[in-house]
Interface confidence: low
Amino acid sequence: VPRWRQQWSGSGTTSRFPETVLARCVKYTEVHPEMRHVDCQSVWDAFKGAFISKYPCNITEEDYQPLVKLGTQTVPCNKTLLWSRIKDLAHQFTQVQRDMFTLEDMLLGYLADDLTWCGEFNTFEINYQSCPDWRKDCSNNPVSVFWKTVSRRFAETACGVVHVMLNGSRSKIFDKNSTFGSVEVHNLQPEKVQALEAWVIHGGREDSRDLCQDPTIKELESIISKRNIRFFCKNIYRPDKFLQCVKNPEDSSCLSGIHHHHHH
């Protein structure tokens, strides 16, 4: 008889979740020599331990600490790229600019990117049917708490000039409720981070507005400045051209006009 199981509003755990995490871990540690010491079985055990047998609306950052410890990794100063609502372009950028890193270029972010997972209270089973939705069910669910935990850590360890890619096509270019706005911004360390440079990515080819003057960017500037961190903003008018110029900086058309610069 199939046992009764809680029905959540969100989609269930990604199929083959344990195998995917383990395979990603092995692949990552093979490609990144500085992480070769990581034991992927221990990583999976710590990941599993964070949510298996636990009520999926009562997960805490504490639950993920053993995993965070195992995945400890540092990014060189000036090489952190945060993003908000524009993941694909951020990832395309770091795939070309290999010395810059988003959270998903780090082990823990790489393991969990685009995956969903949850368990159930008092059973060792993974719930493949449904998982809590952040809005409709609860915010303290395994996926949301994971990203909050690793995002906080990623921001805390950043140093030098930190960059953030923001989506200029959205009504709120900077959204205080995004992971960037609610977690990362507040966990940059003023002693280590000299500046935050926002790259506002324009959507339309003909768009020549200065989105660095957008009220939400001004709000971001205010928050950052009050945290004793300097703020800069750049308009990236042609993201396609921008990426092309990152790939081929020698291209003669790349010497000017790629992105308008604003020093606030």
Partner: antibody, heavy 115, light 107 residues
């Protein structure tokens, strides 16, 4: 290492104003916000407000709103704190400070308000 | 505004003993917390910043720990010159806020 050097002690009459200066050396002046903190005799430390010179952006503690003005002159790397409508309770040591690696403090300026 | 609460208000300790001072923030300040020592008639002296980093020239007997909302300053073996008032301060956000101070006195 950043050094913050403040102007000398002042004796003021009630109702008047005082302007204390804070000159920074080392580091980029416009980059790091400067805060002003005061300590009345036998009391704790209280933040009055701050400025980010590069933006001219200021923030004041509610308690001092309307009475304090913080400004900065980038050309001389100097921040100023002016407190108006002085009363005897404003007798205190006034410090400028900023986060820069650690937290650097000026040596303090004693302002005495007395009739 | 973030409220910083220090405990105890007064700590009586004998020279050579260990002193543990606590500071609690009303909301998370990450690790943007400093500790100061102040003696009568003197300016505050920065001991610890970043919750656990000793400022230049501060003896190793002073150590700081904690993050988020709970912080501790430990003086491993009190010397006569350590008897003073100690303040914690958050600088995570303006307005900077300070604890009310803990007076460490000779027992």
């Amino acid at each position: 290492q950043v050094q913050l050097v403040q102007s000398g002690a002042e004796v003021k009459k009630p109702g008047s104003s005082v302007k204390v200066s804070c000159k920074a050396s080392g580091g980029v002046f416009s980059q790091f916000p400067i805060s002003w903190v005061r300590q009345a005799p036998g009391q704790g430390l209280e933040w009055m407000g701050g400025i980010i010179a590069g933006y001219g952006a200021t923030e004041y503690a509610q308690k001092f709103q309307g009475r304090v003005t913080i400004t900065a002159d980038e050309s001389t790397s100097t921040a100023y704190m002016e407190l108006s409508s002085l009363r005897s309770e404003d007798t205190a040591v006034y410090y400028c400070a900023r986060v820069y690696g650690g937290i650097d403090w000026g040596q303090g300026t004693l302002v005495t308000v007395s009739s | 505004e973030i409220v910083m609460t220090q405990s105890p208000a007064t700590l009586s300790v004998s020279p050579g003993e260990r002193a543990t001072l606590s500071c609690r923030a009303s909301q998370s300040v990450s690790s943007n917390l400093a500790w100061y020592q102040q003696k009568p008639g003197q300016a505050p002296r920065l001991l610890i910043y970043g919750a656990s980093t000793r400022a230049t020239g501060i003896p190793a007997r002073f150590s700081g720990s904690g993050s988020g909302t709970e912080f501790t300053l430990t003086i491993s073996s009190l010397q006569s010159e350590d008897f003073a008032v100690y303040y914690c301060q958050q600088y995570n956000n303006w307005p900077w806020t300070f604890g009310q101070g803990t007076k460490v006195e000779i027992k």
